[in-house]
């Protein structure tokens, strides 16, 4: 029987969500509990690491949100952003695979604000690089498993 | 081994951005530099050409923006859109396969503005049929590889 | 020849959305015309039930749109929701994947609306559970094919 | 094919009137509403207006809500922007456009469009 492909889905860590509205690398994120789950990929210090050279399908879903009881939002106009973001130890270096968002305007006077974010794409990946999601605005992440978390699964071999 | 499944994974030629604002077919992908990258599949005239019949998923994440040291932007009131495109060469047809986007208004007086849009899904192609990509206001996009893009790999078999 | 991988595409039944602004499930899919298709899964009231224990990638697309010659919007903020529910039938019980969306002003007087929704992800399934979509605002839906779907297809075996 | 020709934009006044006109040709019946937009100096386009075929109901942009008035002439096929108590920022060149579905993003026919200047 065939090796089993590495993939993973994690879930963001609502217990460890950065203040403040500048970009972050989000760096605590459940990987084994709820639908978060991992096999033949490593977590380490939240980044996801490749252990098996491979083409993988790459995704991530940010949802941000705030509601008028929380005071106002940091600034008038937002940038609410996410970055997929490859770093190779051997050469250390850090590249955006994907990025996406939406700039917003929030000092309006409704009870509830909501945005999400969804990106995805394919990628050559080789054992020891590492996967980490950056945001802008991180105290307005929501923090359900279902809305805020990143994955990846290996769809084929390199050669 | 098994031969290797189709794959594509194309990013915006930034030199070749259409201006204006009506819907274009955005015709100059990269497949060979940076994250780009093509395998059992082909690229001609800005189509990516099925080789080989199969289930694809195909996707696609478009990236608009602007700068208040650009100008006003086109109208009052954008509608900000990506439409994934199959066309068969056969019984020569075109079909849209996704959709995706938002209307904005980018009248007010913010410095920057952004907007993305990802649709994804998974689709019958066979040999021969083409897949492009429309936007509305091409003037806008950005033309960085991590912000619009699309791709396909394929995923199995027809029978 | 390995047994074929499940997949479902389904599309939006135009003729069957509910109207309303509250949360609904959306009960009624194609799946069998123009890009909708199953294999070894099964629509079921609505439903997409497993068949086949698996990973499976999921995904929805899912469109919002209002015109003026229709009225008014149902409220000044919307929320433009959707949720990727998973419903297991052998121990009674509803719990989302994915959720995704906006808050929205419509009440501008642009002559078109439209916003769109795009969420994906990698899950565990088990023989007899179900996926299914609930949306706000259905009265707003987009009923076109390319506009309004889900899908799911099995990337690999459990063990 | 439908074919749209603007006219009537000239020089004219603060607090002044101007009506333009949009002449309609070809396939009148596969038109779904007509608009007027403008494009001021240094600006993007605007909506200004629409008119339904079904119906003539009208909808107008806030900035125009009050002065300027759309209607249409069936017998001769013309739409009309009646613009009343005009202001300098109502310069601009006005362009006349046709869509033929409801759910379509885009305009499918414009003019060549009528210049207006308002001076003070």
């Known amino acids: 029987k065939p090796e089993a492909q590495p993939f993973a889905h994690l879930t963001i860590n609502a217990a460890s969500i950065p203040s403040g509205s500048h970009k972050v690398t989000l760096s605590s994120w459940y990987h084994d509990r709820g639908w978060a789950k991992i096999s033949n990929m490593t977590l380490s210090n939240g980044k996801l690491r490749v252990n098996q050279d491979g083409f993988y399908y790459l995704y991530a879903n940010i949802c941000f949100r705030h509601h008028e009881t929380s005071g106002s939002v940091p600034t008038d106009y937002l940038q609410l952003m996410v970055y997929v973001v490859k770093t190779s130890i051997k050469i250390p270096s850090s590249h955006n695979l994907m990025k996406g968002g939406s700039t917003k305007n929030w000092s309006g006077n409704s009870e509830f604000h909501f945005y999400s974010i969804n990106v995805g794409g394919f990628f050559k990946l080789r054992a020891g690089e590492e996967i980490s999601i950056q945001v802008s605005n991180p105290s307005l992440l929501d923090p359900d498993q279902d809305a805020t978390y990143f994955g990846a699964f290996k769809v084929q071999d390199i050669d | 081994k098994p031969e290797a499944q189709p794959f594509a994974h194309l990013t915006i030629n930034a030199a070749s951005i259409p201006s204006g604002s009506h819907k274009v077919t955005l015709s100059s992908w990269y497949h060979d530099r940076g994250w780009a990258k093509i395998s059992n599949m082909t690229l001609s005239n800005g189509k990516l050409r099925v080789n080989q019949d199969g289930f694809y998923y195909l996707y696609a994440n478009i990236c608009f923006r602007h700068h208040e040291t650009s100008g006003s932007v086109p109208t009052d009131y954008l509608q900000l859109m990506v439409y994934v495109v199959k066309t068969s060469i056969k019984i020569p047809s075109s079909h849209n396969l996704m959709k995706g986007g938002s209307t904005k208004n980018w009248s007010g007086n913010s410095e920057f503005h952004f907007y993305s849009i990802n649709v994804g899904g998974f689709f019958k192609l066979r040999a021969g049929e083409e897949i492009s990509i429309q936007v509305s206001n091409p003037s806008l996009l950005d033309p960085d590889q991590d912000a619009t893009y699309f791709g396909a790999f394929k995923v199995q078999d027809i029978d | 020849k390995p047994e074929a991988q499940p997949f479902a595409h389904l599309t939006i039944n135009a003729a069957s959305i509910p109207s309303g602004s509250h949360k609904v499930t959306l009960s009624s899919w194609y799946h069998d015309r123009g890009w909708a298709k199953i294999s070894n899964m099964t629509l079921s009231n609505g439903k997409l039930r497993v068949n086949q224990d698996g990973f499976y990638y999921l995904y929805a697309n899912i469109c919002f749109r209002h015109h003026e010659t229709s009225g008014s919007v149902p409220t000044d903020y919307l929320q433009l929701m959707v949720y990727v529910v998973k419903t297991s039938i052998k121990i009674p019980s509803s719990h989302n994947l994915m959720k995704g969306g906006s808050t929205k002003n419509w009440s501008g007087n642009s002559e078109f609306h439209f916003y769109s929704i795009n969420v994906g992800g990698f899950f565990k399934l088990r023989a007899g559970e179900e996926i299914s979509i609930q949306v706000s605002n259905p009265s707003l839906l987009d009923p076109d094919q390319d506009a309004t779907y889900f899908g799911a297809f099995k990337v690999q075996d459990i063990d | 094919e439908v074919q749209l020709v603007e006219s009537g934009g000239k020089l004219v006044q603060a607090g002044g009137s101007l009506r333009l006109s949009c002449a309609v040709s070809?396939?009148?019946?596969?038109?779904?509403?007509m608009a007027w937009f403008r494009q001021g100096p240094g600006k993007g386009r605007e909506s200004v207006g629409r008119?339904?075929?079904?119906?003539?109901?009208?909808y107008y942009a806030d900035s125009v809500k009050g002065r300027f008035t759309i209607s249409r002439d069936n017998a001769t096929n013309t739409v009309y922007l009646q613009m009343n108590s005009l202001k300098p920022e109502d310069t601009a060149v006005y362009y006349c456009a046709g869509k033929t579905t409801k759910w379509s993003l885009e305009y499918d026919y414009w003019g060549q469009g009528t210049q207006v200047t308002v001076s003070s």
């Open positions: 008119i339904y075929w079904s119906d003539d109901n009208t």
């Open positions: 070809g396939r009148t019946s596969s038109i779904y509403n």
